[in-house]
Amino acid sequence: QGWQAFKNDATEIIPELGEYPEPPPELENNKTMNRAENGGRPPHHPFETKDVSEYSCRELHFTRYVTDGPCRSAKPVTELVCSGQCGPARLLPNAIGRGKWWRPSGPDFRCIPDRYRAQRVQLLCPGGEAPRARKVRLVASCKCKRLTRFHNQSELKDFGTEAARPQKGRKPRPRARSAKANQAELENAY
């Protein structure tokens, strides 16, 4: 019934609204810090800098279909996925080119959506049902945020007023996880 072949990574047919891409696993918050480790302090960063504009994170483009019950968007929408790693911007181009990636020694920085945009999409429905229009929220840009901890809970804080923007026009190489696999996971999430 409906778009039978349109399934998520659990191979179950999506029965409801399918708008939001799932955040990559490393972006899920609620990771609490064991206060016995590091004396409750964030781990040392080898490339500590006071200039927030030197920090950057990667924007990966992907396309996905939007679903609503049995209906699916006529065309896929293009959206950004914000990579979970943040590092000094000056290292990114060369390091990525060499296949190396600067990694902080702890989960203190996150690359997360900064701005969103709304896009209206036309949904096609099976069985002669009239097409539907939906307005979806899509990630428009990414930023670095620092993860601060208090009361043993995680919270994301802005890493500066104007968080560092990734360099435009560069196509970073995906990490060990292939872009295709990443797209498959994200494409059909809610």
């Epitope: 609204l17 891409p21 799932e22 955040p23 918050n29 997360i112 229009a133 809610y190």
Partner: antibody, heavy 116, light 111 residues
Framework: QVQLVESGGGLVQPGGSLRLSCAAS????????LSWVRQAPGKGLEWVSV???????YYADSVKGRFTISRDNSKNTLYLQMNSLRAEDTAVYYC??????????WGQGTLVTVSS | DIALTQPASVSGSPGQSITISCTGT?????????VSWYQQHPGKAPKLMIY???NRPSGVSNRFSGSKSGNTASLTISGLQAEDEADYYC???????????FGGGTKLTVL
């Protein structure tokens, strides 16, 4: 089916703290934006806060710096930590699922009373 | 601060049609952003009735319809029934897509 169940409301003194929970089921919790919306007795609805799938948080000016929204994706639970509570925070607090820029499912609400 | 303005109350007889308006600034109900409508019976949680100006969720009667002209959105209920008596709220989102605003609510009385 989608279900949202709030808990944690009660009577608290001004300046006190309270943590609300919202247990969710019936949908892919970690992929949705989730909000808290409140309603003071006899008054209208007021949006309080939202948390994105990435854990980024946004607040209404009236609660900024006092309330903290968070989520535990492993428990399918949304939280609202409320500190420095004031009499004007007295309300029924609803958690709501945000889909396609509107709230398509709401919990039944939990009453928070701030009074000495 | 952006605000959505609704009439405090409207009334109608069974079988009649009524319209509830929701007026705001161009940044919250103009061409950029869309409006949703919620119904709330006393002591109950709000229920989504209309979204994206004129879309009805499944299960909502086709007696409910929405429209928008300029910076005013409207909810029309045709063929009024006793169970339609409730409070109705319009809502929209901020330009950043990360905040929301509600109208003050309209009490609908079915005479």
């Amino acid at each position: 089916q989608v279900q949202l169940v709030e808990s944690g409301g009660g009577l608290v003194q001004p300046g006190g703290s309270l943590r609300l929970s919202c247990a969710a089921s019936g949908f892919t919790f970690r992929s949705h934006w989730l909000s808290w919306v409140r309603q003071a007795p006899g008054k209208g609805l007021e949006w309080v806060s939202v948390i994105t799938p990435y854990g980024d948080t946004y607040y209404a000016d009236s609660v900024k710096g006092r309330f903290t929204i968070s989520r535990d994706n492993s428990k399918n639970t949304l939280y609202l930590q409320m500190n420095s509570l004031r009499a004007e925070d007295t309300a029924v607090y609803y958690c709501a699922r945000d889909t396609y820029l509107h709230f398509d499912y709401w919990g039944q609400g939990t009453l928070v009373t701030v009074s000495s | 601060d952006i605000a959505l303005t609704q009439p405090a109350s409207v009334s109608g007889s069974p079988g009649q049609s009524i319209t509830i308006s929701c007026t705001g600034t161009s940044s919250d109900v103009g061409d950029i952003n869309d409006v949703s409508w919620y119904q709330q019976h006393p002591g109950k949680a709000p229920k989504l009735m209309i979204y994206d100006v004129n879309n009805r969720p499944s299960g909502v009667s086709n007696r409910f319809s929405g429209s928008k002209s300029g910076n005013t959105a409207s909810l029309t209920i045709s063929g009024l029934q006793a169970e339609d008596e409730a409070d109705y709220y319009c809502s929209s989102y901020g330009e950043s897509l990360t905040s929301y605003v509600f109208g003050g609510g309209t009490k609908l009385t079915v005479l």
